[in-house]
Amino acid sequence: PLATIPVSTTSLTSSEGSTISTPSVDISTPVTTSIVGDQCSRCKNGGFWDGLKCQCLTPYYGESCEEVVNSIDIAPPETVSAQMELTVTVTSVKFTDELKNHSSQEFREFNKTFTEQMNIVYSGIPEYVGVNITNLRLGSVVVEHDVLLRTKYTPEYKTALDNATEVVKQKITKVTTEQIMTNDNCSALMCFNTTGTQVQNITVTQYDPVEECRQKAEEYEDYFLVEYRDQKPYCISPCESGFNASKNCNHGKCQMSQNGARCLCVTTETHWYSGEDCNQGTQKSHHHHHH
């Protein structure tokens, strides 16, 4: 037997002026039918029948997956990070082959001192997480390492991380200039060769809420946009109320189609409404306009 879907019919007039008696269905979307066993459901737009109801794919919803949602969940990461690849030359420790072995006691002791030193150097940077030595080589000890930075996601996260990387550069340059050997002795925790300090590469987390929004909106990508509320991005269509881009349909219902958002105007016992925003009311008995 066919699965019957109750549909409420409303008398609506499109902003072009013709009156349509229609369920809340976008008639411009193609119908694909999903059949499971003897249950047949008109699950449109890639939705499938789970035996009870249509399971719809983003950005669709409704009993037959015929309507387009007004907002799509996008989830920016809690935190975003940057990784700086740096090289410094430590002169207060002489290189030995054991330092190349990351499981040796030599490496562990060097790593402990180097980490303590860098924690002191970067202590004023709130985004600083730590350092990770990637390689040690001769010269006295050339230390290839990563400086890890992290911050909470905000729309300005790139600026925050860019600023933090600049401060890292300033601080490592300062310490490697100041903490130098005197008469082959080092009075600091570590001493450095000033000329051995280099920033090799900087990698920043890439997260673009606009791109995520467009991807999830699929063929409606041109009509969904990102607006921020309390520094959180929202992927919305103009049919979502309460945002700057929200479409005001006045005496009508906002509906998404593949041509964008449109207003379907209502007809009441006393008036019919027309206009792009359903703001032109015509009294049925007197036939004059109220603006």
Epitope: S92, K94, Q105, E106, C186, L189
Partner: nanobody, 123 residues
Framework: EVQLVESGGGVVQPGGSLRLSCAAS????????WGWFRQAPGKEREAVAL???????FYADSVKGRFTISQDNTKNTLYLQMNSLRAEDTAVYYC?????????????????WGQGTMVTVSS
């Protein structure tokens, strides 16, 4: 893990001598760095005499010509011969070690420490 035990401290008159010893557990004297630090009451710990396996040595200016650092690899023992002792040499003397070949006088760069032995120079 390196374990260090100092001995040889005591009370001595000004101008006298003492020899401090530091016994290390394990076969560790063939590499790394060894040293003596001291800490007088109310003062920071300071480097007195240091030595590394590549031949580097350091003496604090205040002890040059009076103190001598040496090691006996066969006995895994570090020594500090202290001559012409002065009242200002009074302190707790600590033996320190690192498997790294160090050039630093900063005690925070040294990873292994003994419990210390007291040296009092008083008439």
């Amino acid at each position: 893990e390196v374990q260090l035990v100092e001995s040889g401290g005591g009370v001595v008159q000004p101008g006298g001598s003492l020899r401090l010893s530091c016994a290390a557990s394990g076969d560790t004297f063939s590499r790394g760095s060894w040293g003596w630090f001291r800490q007088a009451p109310g003062k920071e710990r300071e480097a007195v005499a240091l030595i590394s396996s590549d031949g580097w040595t350091f003496y604090a200016d205040s002890v040059k010509g009076r103190f001598t650092i040496s090691q006996d690899n066969t006995k895994n023992t570090l020594y500090l011969q202290m001559n012409s002792l002065r009242a200002e040499d009074t302190a707790v003397y600590y033996c320190a070690a690192s498997v790294l070949v160090l050039r630093t006088l900063n005690p925070k760069a040294w990873h292994h420490w003994g419990q210390g032995t007291m040296v009092t120079v008083s008439s």
